[in-house]
């Protein structure tokens, strides 16, 4: 009897893997072996595909072969037992294109409010991915173990910290790797779960701001306890972006380390132009605490980024704002090509109490003032990406006295 | 394959100060920190400090703050610890080790360096 | 600093038992653990780190668990090449400490 060809050949390329699938055309016929062949281009003859040779399954590994990656190859399979089937030949496929990203590996750290999550290839040194292993980003799916509610967390890099969470809770996690350049999306990790510690004693420090003043930095932070020493830690931040080395190292700032005071002042050029990463840790002696969120510090914006000049229109009842561009040295002004964000801050002049307001408009109207009042007005510019989170100094506070009744108009 | 080599046993008097070397091989020390930990006979081990032969960086423990100096040298490859004025107390074994692909644990160690004070 | 206790300095089982060697730091310090094993005249060895991913090559009856304060390492179905000392160690902060030990001993 005539052997058929074997049919509905796949070819799954996982990272380094190459699997090869495919249909027996006769179940009835036993003891029937397949074997492949493959053809580069540009060649006439065709070799016999080690790995998938006299297989008595319908499925074959030729991950030991050493190919191009990035040339186009051609396969063809029969089936033997006395006779041999004719050859199939399976459509002709580039490797690299047909690849796909396998799952990564996963690492776990746990704090009381805060889980690290480190992320690297599934497959060590991969051939397949040896051009563009610097290029992996990688997305996440996080949920609490006991909700199953699922938060996205999309283009993050080989170490990746979460946030504000609960402690003593369990969350699970899965994360994919993607190579934006090759339009790839690989698939899913097993799901990781952890559970956050009990919580710390001493919560870390919050709301970190860097400001300029005169030549000098000024970075700023919120604790909830007196008498603390403080530490600053920085960090460049395109090293989050190496994909082998999780091994951060982390610098001291000399004029911020075991400061006892809420703020530390350091100069403008221990930080040469870049993109940094800033820690703070609280210490009471005894117990220390997990470090603060880390908060993105680019040395272009913060060196520009300066408080706003406005001019007040005064009625009966309101102010009027004209927010414009702040003046350098030699009264021209700066521009500024990135979107703003405006606080104002105005407060009776014979009083404590501050109001607020936040804009993104550069002009503004500051309400329900009272008539022949001397009013104090100070603002502030924020970069509107939250990540950086810049915030230049408060202009100098201008005082201006409301109109008489009925002039609001 | 990682490795660390330390320099031989050490006798010295009171008083006196010796320098240890450990010479890494297997990788570069400027892409790592290198730790040294101590641990006297039929006791615990004891974390002195580490460099960051990148820049030259250093932490103690407060305890060994006037006691240990840490330095490297990127050219040779190479960590040093120097003690000084020694006392009987600090005769103990030294290791120097070196943290794995995460930040503050230790999975390669040096086969540790005898250091003996005595008169 | 962070002390780190091993309240049981000495510990003695048998071949074939499972045993825990307990570790309590003094303050939470995450899941920033390790365990060491230690034999004598040798180095420490990196047995777990991150409080419960094994090393390369440490067999799998070596297991870590706990996080916070409270922190195990469990060997189960001992073997005479597990006498040995077993330190932890925390790195959630410096100076990283150690705690003082805990002695295996085999019946």
């Known amino acids: 009897k005539n052997l058929k060809s074997p049919q509905k050949v796949e070819v799954d390329i996982i990272d380094d893997n190459f699997i090869l699938r495919w249909n027996r055309s006769d179940e009835s016929v036993g003891n029937v072996t397949f074997s492949f062949d493959y053809q580069k281009t540009g060649m006439d003859n065709w070799i016999k595909l080690s790995g998938c040779q006299n297989i008595t399954s319908t499925k074959c590994n030729f991950s030991s072969l050493k190919l191009n990656v990035y040339e186009e190859i051609k396969l063809r399979i029969r089936a033997e037992k006395e006779n041999t089937s004719s050859w199939y030949e399976v459509d002709s496929f580039t490797p690299f294109r047909k690849a796909q990203i396998g799952p990564p590996e996963v690492h776990l750290e746990a704090e009381d409010k805060a889980i690290v999550i480190h992320i690297s290839p599934g497959t060590k040194d991969s051939v397949m991915w040896a051009l563009d292993g610097l290029s992996f980003t990688y997305s996440l799916v996080i949920w609490k173990n006991s909700s199953g509610v699922e938060e996205r967390i999309e283009n993050i890099y080989s170490r990746h910290k979460i946030y504000k969470l609960s402690p003593e809770t369990t969350y699970c996690l899965k994360v994919k790797a993607a190579l934006l350049t090759s339009w790839k999306i690989g698939v899913y990790s097993p799901v990781h779960c952890i559970k956050t510690t009990v919580e710390n004693e001493l919560p870390p420090p919050e709301n970190i701001e860097v400001s300029v003043q005169n030549q000098n930095y000024v970075l700023k932070w919120d604790y909830t306890y007196a008498n603390m020493t403080f530490q600053v830690q920085w960090l460049h931040a395109f090293l989050k972006r190496n994909p082998g080395n999780h091994l951060y190292k982390w610098k001291q700032i000399p004029d911020c380390e075991n400061v006892k005071t809420t703020q530390c002042v350091f100069p403008q050029n221990v930080f040469q132009k870049g993109i940094y990463l800033l820690r703070v840790q609280a210490s009471d002696g005894n117990n220390t605490s997990f470090w603060s969120e880390e908060i993105k510090f680019d040395t272009e914006i913060q060196a520009f980024l300066l408080p706003p000049v406005f001019n007040i229109r005064s009625l009966s009842d309101s102010f009027h704002i004209y927010i414009g561009a702040p003046k350098q040295s030699g009264n021209t002004p700066v521009i500024q090509d990135y979107p703003l964000i405006y606080e104002i801050i105005f407060w009776e002049n014979t009083s404590n109490a501050e109001r607020k307001i936040i804009e993104k408009k550069t002009d503004v109207t500051v309400p329900n003032l009272k008539p022949l009042t001397v009013y104090c007005v100070k603002a502030r510019a924020h970069t509107m990406d939250e990540k950086l989170n810049k915030s230049s100094v408060f202009s100098d506070a201008v005082c201006e006295k409301t109109k008489p009744g009925n002039t609001s108009k | 394959e990682v490795q660390l080599q330390q320099s031989g046993a050490e006798f010295v008097k009171p008083g006196a100060s010796v320098k240890l070397s450990c010479t890494a091989s297997g990788f570069n020390i400027k892409d790592y920190y290198i730790h040294w930990v101590t641990q006297k006979t039929e006791q615990g081990l004891e974390w002195i400090g580490r460099?960051?032969?990148?820049?030259?960086?250093?932490k103690y423990a407060p305890k060994f703050q006037d006691k240990a100096t840490i330095t490297a040298d990127s050219s040779s490859n190479t960590a040093y610890l120097q003690l000084s004025s020694l006392t009987s107390v600090d005769t103990a074994v030294y290791f120097c080790?070196?943290?794995?692909?995460?930040?503050?644990?230790?999975?390669?160690w040096g086969q540790g360096t005898l250091v003996s004070v005595s008169a | 600093d962070i002390v780190m206790t091993q309240s049981q300095k000495f510990m003695s089982t048998s071949v074939g038992d499972r045993v825990s060697v307990t570790c309590k730091a003094r303050q939470s310090v995450g899941t920033y653990v390790a365990w060491y094993q230690q034999k004598p005249g040798q180095s420490p060895k990196a047995l777990i780190y991150?409080?419960?991913y094994r090393y390369n090559g440490v067999p799998d009856r070596f297991t870590g668990s706990g996080s916070g304060t409270d922190f195990t390492l469990t060997i189960s179905n001992v073997q005479s090449e597990d006498l040995a000392d077993y330190f932890c160690q925390q790195y959630h902060s410096y100076p990283y400490t150690f705690g003082g030990g805990t002695k295996l001993e085999i019946k």
């Open positions: 460099i960051d032969p990148e820049d030259g960086e250093t």
């Open positions: 080790s070196r943290e794995g692909s995460f930040t503050g644990w230790f999975p390669y």
């Open positions: 991150s409080t419960s």
